[in-house]
């Protein structure tokens, strides 16, 4: 789902206040709900009728350093007999998420938010039929 | 997928540098790839064999202010005849994501990262547990 544009409001101080110096803000250390964990049903990526694989990208200057992307294994969906049914489509489910990018020059360290598109898994859909003229 | 714990490394300066004052860091204004957008297949939430609805939560002191949560509509999955197949299970696909929480007292504004669990959509799986005979 879409993250709306920041515009010029969220990270600004109220108009009556002096502007933020040097185009940066104060980010408190520590993460709220850091211990909260995804605990999805087991092995849904292989039990799904639209199964997927995971690829991990790793970047030490990003938080989280590890970003996991799903790729649908099939174009069609898997039927009860374990065969691919090409009358149905496996499609990716995407999500926009934020990560934090670390930038440093010597002892000067700053951080910036970055929007990342993550494919979280796949679902099986009835196709939209494109009639060929 | 899981966001690992920060530990005490990512947001710290190198050991040879003076510590960060007052437990806060410098966050640059602006978001990298802010214009990047999800472009999923149309209406997959209603075309899926494990369809879902969306619920929007809104909080002006959070970025993004709008967080969208999916809820699976059915316990089973929808078959080719549009009927529910109770031999299969609809299950939610979850993702940990970061949001930014704004805290202000008068003209003093600071920000903090928060981890949020988002249900992005649903997928149809072969059951592990046979509750229903």
């Amino acid at each position: 789902r879409k993250i709306p544009k920041v515009g010029h409001t969220f990270f600004q101080k109220p108009e009556s206040c002096p502007p933020v110096p040097g185009g940066s803000m104060k980010l408190d250390i520590g993460i709220i709900n850091e211990n909260q964990r995804v605990s999805m049903s087991r092995n849904i990526e292989s039990r799904s009728t639209s199964p997927w694989n995971y690829t991990v990208t790793w970047d030490p200057n990003r938080y989280p350093s590890e970003v996991v992307q799903a790729q649908c294994r099939n174009l069609g969906c898997i039927n009860a007999q374990g065969k691919e049914d090409i009358s149905m489509n496996s499609v990716p489910i995407q999500q926009e998420t934020l990560v934090v990018r670390r930038k440093h020059q010597g002892c000067s360290v700053s951080f910036q938010l970055e929007k990342v598109l993550v494919t979280v898994g796949c679902t099986c859909v009835t196709p939209v039929i494109h009639h060929v003229q | 997928r899981k966001i690992p714990k920060v530990g005490h490394t990512f947001f710290q300066k190198p050991e040879s540098c003076p510590p960060v004052p007052g437990g806060s860091m410098k966050l640059d204004i602006g978001i990298i790839n802010e214009n990047q957008r999800v472009s999923m297949s149309r209406n997959i939430e209603s075309r899926s064999t494990s369809p879902w609805n969306y619920t929007v939560t809104w909080d002006p002191n959070r970025y993004p202010s709008e967080v969208v949560q999916a809820q699976c509509r059915n316990l089973g999955c929808i078959n080719a005849q549009g009927k529910e197949d109770i031999s299969m299970n609809s299950v939610p696909i979850q993702q940990e994501t970061l949001v930014v929480r704004r805290k202000h007292q008068g003209c003093s504004v600071s920000f903090q990262l928060e981890k949020v669990l988002v249900t992005v959509g649903c997928t149809c799986v072969t059951p592990v547990i046979h509750h229903v005979q």
Partner: nanobody, 123 residues
Framework: QVQLVESGGGLVQVGGSLRLSCEVS????????MGWFRQAPEKEREFVAA????????RYAHFVKGRFTISRDNAKNTVHLQMDSLKPEDTAVYYC????????????????WGQGTQVTVSS
């Protein structure tokens, strides 16, 4: 933290009826389904019935099918279990709980249960 308060249990004769209620608070927005479970003395806790929050889609264990009906009141965040044609083997403590993964939810993954409500069916 999800909070669950079950009520409506009691002592009833064979063939009688009871209506159990479960008041739920603290559920996440994305909550998917609710279930009723039961545990008889010296037995494992078992699934009884489930209902989805949105569609009202329901499922029953084979041993209660046709006798028990699960329903929900979204406005009051309450789930009910109407129990008819009760049998002695229905004697147990009945619990409700969130089913975050629908019918894929494993009972051994629950961190929290309410106090339950005792149902006793006498012959």
């Amino acid at each position: 933290q999800v909070q669950l308060v079950e009520s409506g249990g009691g002592l009833v004769q064979v063939g009688g009826s009871l209506r159990l209620s479960c008041e739920v608070s603290g559920l996440p927005v994305s909550s998917y389904a609710m279930g009723w479970f039961r545990q008889a003395p010296e037995k494992e806790r078992e699934f009884v019935a489930a209902i989805s929050w949105i569609g009202g889609d329901s499922r029953y264990a084979h041993f209660v099918k046709g006798r028990f009906t699960i329903s929900r009141d979204n406005a009051k965040n309450t789930v009910h279990l109407q129990m008819d044609s009760l049998k002695p083997e229905d004697t147990a403590v009945y619990y409700c709980n969130d089913m975050p993964y629908g019918l894929d939810t494993r009972m051994d993954e629950y961190e929290y249960w309410g106090q339950g409500t005792q149902v006793t069916v006498s012959s």
